[in-house]
Interface confidence: low
Amino acid sequence: FERTRSLQDPCSNCPAGTFCDNNRNQICSPCPPNSFSSAGGQRTCDICRQCKGVFRTRKECSSTSNAECDCTPGFHCLGAGCSMCEQDCKQGQELTKKGCKDCCFGTFNDQKRGICRPWTNCSLDGKSVLVNGTKERDVVCGPSPADLSPGASSVTPPAPAREPGHSPQ
């Protein structure tokens, strides 16, 4: 709806949901259906995004805000504002140009998207492998062999307690 008009620019007072119609003496006209203006002072309304095909509607278009899409089951969003939908793979797989492929030995993927990543190298941290890795899960590192000498606990001691009300630096 039109607000009080500014003497400098009549269009500056056209609110979201309207456009400043130069063909009609710069009156604030409502956005037609399937279009929107999310800010005031616009000379045109933008066409609503249509969520078609592999996209599905997450939020309907209104006169003041664009539709928002997500992806149909079996696909996930990529890019700003879900500009693309990419096929899901199973855990333990990654998407290649030829489709979903199992992770190579020594790599894993615990999600339905993304690439296979190498297992953690426990020895780099001076630790040993406590639980072996799989295609779906990373290895679990345990204490170093030296820590497992007689009398040593295999459980990592808890961090020192902090005084209440103090946050870590």
């Epitope: 709806f1 039109e2 607000r3 609110p15 979201a16 949901g17 009609r24 009156i27 604030c28 006209s29 409502p30 956005c31 037609p32 259906p33 209104s62 006169s63 003041t64 805000s65």
Partner: antibody, heavy 116, light 107 residues
Framework: QVQLVQSGSELKKPGASVKVSCKAS????????MHWVRQAPGQGLEWMGW????????TYADDFKGRFVFSLDTSVSTAYLQISSLKAEDTAVYYC?????????WGQGTLVTVSS | DIQMTQSPSSLSASVGDRVTITCKAS??????VAWYQQKPGKVPKLLIY???IRHTGVPSRFSGSGSGTDFTLTISSLQPEDVATYYC?????????FGGGTKVEIK
């Protein structure tokens, strides 16, 4: 689903004030403006004005400037209409209505009766 | 302000009849006209917006047409539940103004 729930009927004396509430649910409150419409007994619909739910800026129809105030509490998704210095001719049902491409959802109405 | 003149102010028709209500704007309002239905003692409901688009859940027997200054609401086959007052409204510019209403009754 979209719902607008208004406060209950009010019986007031001339000169008093009344505050009508309109609680929204089922959508993002600040995405849509809220309009107020009056319907006197046996009469038609009369647009009172609207409030921008994002900025809180009200716009009043000429006949409703002065004694009528629109306000918001976005934390509880509620719009308010306050009428001061009530007169007998303010007796009416007051509706809030969400605005998209038109007034697409309405509250159930609040009857305000002004009588001595 | 833009005046919206509705006619007739009331009508009586039989179940199954085709009913037409007209609304004339005092100046060009493009297609920015909505139609509302208000049943006795009930809340107004949006039927049609942008002159011809049915709101969600509105039966297909209701249709709207027109642009510029002349608009029409048609009920293709009147049903008992259609007894109500119907209002047009221009929303082309502030203030958005309503027509005076058309009361529809069953013979």
């Amino acid at each position: 689903q979209v719902q607008l729930v208004q406060s209950g009927s009010e019986l007031k004396k001339p000169g008093a004030s009344v505050k009508v509430s309109c609680k929204a649910s089922g959508y993002t409150f600040t995405d849509y403006s809220m309009h107020w419409v009056r319907q006197a007994p046996g009469q038609g619909l009369e647009w009172m004005g609207w409030i921008n739910t994002e900025t809180g800026e009200p716009t009043y129809a000429d006949d409703f400037k002065g004694r009528f105030v629109f306000s918001l509490d976005t934390s509880v998704s509620t719009a308010y209409l306050q009428i001061s210095s009530l007169k007998a001719e303010d007796t009416a049902v007051y509706y809030c209505a969400r605005y998209d491409y038109a007034m697409d959802y309405w509250g159930q109405g609040t009857l305000v009766t002004v009588s001595s | 302000d833009i005046q919206m003149t509705q006619s007739p102010s009331s009508l009586s028709a039989s179940v199954g009849d085709r009913v037409t209500i007209t609304c004339k704007a005092s100046q060009d309002v493009s297609s920015a006209v909505a139609w509302y239905q208000q049943k006795p003692g009930k809340v107004p409901k949006l039927l049609i917006y942008w002159a011809s688009i049915r709101h969600t859940g509105v039966p297909s027997r209701f249709s709207g047409s027109g642009s510029g200054t002349d608009f029409t609401l048609t009920i293709s086959s009147l049903q008992p539940e259609d007894v109500a007052t119907y209002y047009c409204q221009q929303r082309y510019t502030t203030p958005p103004t309503f027509g005076g209403g058309t009361k529809v009754e069953i013979k």
